[in-house]
Each structure stands twice: as C-alpha cells, then as structure tokens.
C-alpha cells in the first residue's frame, strides 16, 4: 500500500538508485502501488538488461516510480526522453513483442527540461 | 567475410564449471548482439541468452538465470559464455549465433561452429 | 513464453518431390517467424525470414507463407542437398522460441 496524497520513499530496488528518492502512486498507469508498478516493470527488464538506451533506466523509473515533489505533484517523464528511448530501443521493442502502454506513447507526453519537470496533480488526473 | 568461431570440445565433471568462446570476424563486432544457443544430443535448440558486445550488457532465459554469466572482450572480439554447476543435462552443443539486423527485427544470421560440453562422472 | 510447434517431426521425400513443413505458434507472432536449417554435425543456417523473405544465397525453390499463428515453408522441388532438419523460430516474443524440427529424409 501506499500514503495517500504524500510521498512515499521508493522501495523498487531498480529505481532506488535514481537521483530522486520519493514516489507517489497511482502512477501514468494507473498503478496503484510500488509492488504492482515492479512487476509490470518486468516485461520492460530485457530493455533495461541490454541497456538499449543510456536513458532506459531513468525513463522506466520515471515512467513506473514517478518522482515526487511538493507531496502531492507527480512527475511523469518528458517527451523527449521518452523519444530518444523509443527510438534507440524500438528494434529490440519489436523483436522481444514488449507492448508500450498507451499512457507511455511519447506524443501524450509533454515537452519539458528534465531538470526542471511540469507535474500534474493527481487528484485531478485520475480522480477526476 | 562474417566468421564465429568458437573453442573446442570439453569434458567436464558434474558441479564444475565451463567457458566457451566464440571469436569474431569480417564485421564490426560492437554493432551486433550475440547470442547463446544450446543444443542437446538428438534434441531441438535452446536459446540461453544474449549479450550486447558494445556494453557488455546481457539478458538471459530464466532457465539460466543464476547459472550463465555471458561477457565480451572487445579488443579480441570475442564473447565468452560461462556456465556454472554443470550437470549431465547440459551436455550439448552450444553456439553463439550473431543477430542480424533485418529491417524491424533481429534473426540470427550467422552461427559459431558449435563446441560440444560433455558433463559426465 | 510462446510455443513453437512443428509438423510433421520427420518426413520422407524424394528428389524432385514438393514438399511442405508447418509450423505453429501458442500465439499470433504477425509475420515475425524464421526457418533454419541444420545439417548433421553442423551448426543452423538461416534460410526465410519475416516469414517468406528468402535469406541472400538461399535457392528460390525455398519460400515461406503464413501469419499470425500458422506458417508453412515449402520446397518446391527437393535438391540431394536439401535433406536435413528444418527448424521455425519466433522473434516476436521475449525469449526467441524454436519449434522442435522436422527431420527431411530420403525416402
């Protein structure tokens, strides 16, 4: 389980090398806890083993672990980084049959400086 | 022209360990993944994993998860496959087998001799 | 992960004969299948992929048709040279999967 509308800190051990180290769930995917996000985390693994892309990593933990700031703004990844995966990783995409999630198709995504993320507010994203 | 060729036959002992090489030739040996195959005696084949020789990074079948350790030498172009805790069922050929790049996907293109493991008491 | 499986496992031919091997998959692969062939002692060598794109060398009495989860490769009018084990792969599914072989004898 998770807090409701705080940070939690990351417990993926994937991620936790990431230089952020607090969460918030549900995720883009709706993910409603850590344990749910690191099993779906799996199908992406032979990706993130053969290190397809230098930003595979960071992008599946901003992607299923994402970053929390201010307690209740989530942090999804930017587009560009999501399109520099895409494309660095799609042959291998393709011929391992891993299925990118709709929530995760870079043109839904927004442009943004990794270094200074837009968030949006949970509350409204998937409570409506 | 694109050659593998890997080390020579072995025998070993049940709970020992064994390296195979494959040496590469006739392309450029960081643009391509190289895989593990296995093939026991009379029986059909047995994809065991891949390494990427730019990276050194691997993937490897849950069957071996634990047991194979893959790695790459870059300046001799050569892949290794280690495979540790050997028992009789691993007796088989094994072969590294390159993955070509086709269009949208990756088939395996061109394949090491095959070195023949024999895990025996 | 997804199973391959071979028809006939062993087949008996002659010279000049058309022949055919199915392959099936537990699932739809699209078109993202290989077949090998492998002679004794010897180590696979690629012969269709994609389904029915014939590899550079590869006679053209070979060809390959099918999607989805059945595939077939033909051999149009068998060669001496042609009598071997012919193996299918998908590459459409983590891990690569092969389908058990189907043995061409002489008959």
């Known amino acids: 389980g998770h807090s409701l509308f705080t940070c939690e800190p990351i417990t993926v051990p994937r991620c936790m090398k990431m230089a952020y180290n607090m969460t918030f769930f549900p995720n883009l995917m709706g993910h409603y806890d850590q344990s749910i996000a690191a099993v779906e985390m799996e199908h992406f693994l032979p990706l993130a083993n053969l290190e397809c892309s230098p930003n595979i990593e960071t992008f599946l933990c901003k992607a299923f672990v994402p970053t929390c700031i201010e307690q209740i703004h989530v942090v999804p990844p930017c587009r560009k980084l999501c399109e520099k995966v895409y494309s660095d990783c799609k042959k291998l995409i393709d011929t391992f049959g891993i299925r990118w999630p709709e929530e995760l198709e870079c043109d839904r995504l927004q442009y943004c400086d990794e270094t200074v993320p837009v968030t949006f507010d949970p509350h409204t994203e998937f409570l409506g | 022209q694109v050659q593998l060729v890997q080390s020579g036959a072995e025998v070993k002992k049940p709970g020992a360990s064994v390296k195979v090489s494959c040496k590469a030739s006739g392309y450029t040996f960081t643009s391509y993944y190289m895989n593990w195959v296995r093939q026991a005696p009379g029986q059909g084949l047995e994809w065991m994993g891949i390494i990427s020789p730019s990276g050194g990074s691997t993937s490897y079948a849950q069957k071996f998860q634990g047991r194979v350790t893959m790695t790459r030498d870059t300046s001799t172009s050569t892949v290794y496959m280690e495979l540790s805790s050997l028992r009789s069922e691993d007796t088989a050929v094994y072969y590294c087998?390159?993955?070509?790049?086709?269009?949208?996907?990756?088939?395996?293109?061109?394949w090491g001799q095959g070195t023949l493991v024999t895990v025996s008491s | 992960d997804i199973q391959m499986t071979q028809s006939p496992s062993s087949l008996s031919a002659s010279v000049g004969d058309r022949v055919t091997i199915t392959c099936r998959a537990s699932q739809g692969i699209s078109s993202a299948l290989a077949w090998y062939q492998q002679k004794p002692g010897k180590a696979p060598k690629l012969l269709i992929y994609?389904?029915?794109t014939l590899q550079s060398g590869v006679p053209s009495r070979f060809s390959g048709s099918g999607s989805g989860t059945d595939f077939t490769l033909t051999i149009s009018s068998l060669q001496p040279e042609d009598f071997a084990t012919y193996y299918c792969?998908?590459?459409?599914?983590?891990?690569?999967?092969f389908g058990q072989g189907t043995k061409l004898e002489i008959k």
């Open positions: 792969q998908q590459v459409n599914s983590y891990p690569p999967t």
């Open positions: 087998a390159r993955w070509g790049d086709y269009g949208d996907l990756y088939y395996f293109d061109y």
């Open positions: 994609a389904t029915s």
